[in-house]
Amino acid sequence: CDLPQTHNLRNKRALTLLVQMRRLSPLSCLKDRKDFGFPQEKVDAQQIKKAQAIPVLSELTQQILNIFTSKDSSAAWNTTLLDSFCNDLHQQLNDLQGCLMQQVGVQEFPLTQEDALLAVRKYFHRITVYLREKKHSPCAWEVVRAEVWRALSSSANVLGRLREEK
């Protein structure tokens, strides 16, 4: 499945919007920093084939959307930027799910894929638990925003590699 050209542009725009959404200096939130254990090895462009990458990227995009479409999120961010960001993610998710529909039954390594999907879920579970424990404080959201930027960047790198692979 070939993702549309606009997919890559949306991904870059989402990253830019995430940077613009920043409300606090990361320096003012140093005490709230946390390592969420991003599963780099499971989302690494060099280690996963295209057929496996699509479900993993779809899961990652879905989980980011879940965080930023929550009711607590709408109170934390500039509404215009947040809406644009979520809209871009929705479009990306639609592209990825379109590819997934074409891929049904073509799972080369279902165990490896399940492993990667669960690693992504566990990572986002840590993030959502962190937000709950920090009572969705402004600093907690800033830490999560920066962390999600990292996850989205990684996703963009995988997409870039998949395009080159064609």
Partner: antibody, heavy 122, light 107 residues
Framework: EVQLVQAGAEVKAPGESLRISCKVS????????ISWVRQIPGKGLEWMVK????????IYNPSFQGHVSISVDKSITTVYLQWSSLQASDTAIYYC???????????????WGQGTLVAVSS | DIQMTQSPSSLSASVGDSVTITCRAS??????FHWYRQKPGKAPELLIY???NLQTGVPSRFTGSGSGTECTLTITSLQPDDFATYYC?????????FGQGTKLDVR
């Protein structure tokens, strides 16, 4: 088939150290968290601690923190629960359990070991 | 900690009966409610997860419902195997907590 096989019963004296094990098989070890649950004979269930075998990230129940420690050996797909100094109140059955995590990030205990009875008595 | 309170603590019934067990959380746990059955001398086993989802292999006579601070487990057409202790659990907040258990015995 998913299996969590626990070590046999242990009888110890107060003050002694102990490590009990849970050997898992039938799935990718690093994909799922493992927790330990305590059950004092005739009583209810208490969650103690969980670990992510992928990176050994742990979360303890504050009631048990400092008294027990959890660890993993990825090479032999085994999770351990350890005490450096047992007390009579540690007498209980200890279960290792696997967590499943849904897409909506709800986790629950989908597989249980058979339990290890630890008896601490002078 | 989130307290989980089950009612009743014990219950007598006969084969073929229907019973309902309730679990209340001290604060909202959304749908992070789960139910387990423990037969005497055995490890607990998962029945229902996320308040209402039946675990694979569990008979459909077990049903779960509710969310927020209260959930219920209903067993219809009780079988001899069902006389056991039932526990609810929440995994919404750390530490995870269980209800005190409901012992279901033969009338």
């Amino acid at each position: 088939e998913v299996q969590l096989v626990q070590a046999g019963a242990e009888v110890k004296a107060p003050g002694e150290s102990l490590r009990i094990s849970c050997k898992v098989s039938g799935y990718t070890f690093t994909s799922y968290w493992i927790s330990w649950v305590r059950q004092i004979p005739g009583k209810g269930l208490e969650w103690m601690v969980k670990i992510d075998p992928r990176d050994s990230y742990t979360i303890y129940n504050p009631s048990f923190q400092g008294h027990v420690s959890i660890s993993v050996d990825k090479s032999i797909t085994t999770v351990y629960l350890q005490w450096s100094s047992l007390q009579a109140s540690d007498t209980a059955i200890y279960y290792c359990v696997r967590h499943y995590l849904t897409q909506s990030l709800v986790d629950y205990f989908d597989h249980w070991g058979q339990g290890t009875l630890v008896a601490v008595s002078s | 900690d989130i307290q989980m309170t089950q009612s009743p603590s014990s219950l007598s019934a006969s084969v073929g009966d229907s019973v309902t067990i309730t679990c209340r959380a001290s604060q909202s746990v959304s749908n992070y409610f789960h139910w387990y059955r423990q037969k005497p001398g055995k490890a607990p086993e998962l029945l229902i997860y996320s308040a209402s989802n039946l675990q694979t292999g569990v008979p459909s006579r077990f049903t779960g419902s509710g969310s927020g601070t209260e959930c219920t487990l209903t067993i219809t057409s009780l079988q001899p195997d069902d006389f056991a202790t039932y526990y609810c659990q929440q995994t919404h907040g750390y530490p995870f907590t269980f209800g005190q258990g409901t012992k279901l015995d033969v009338r």
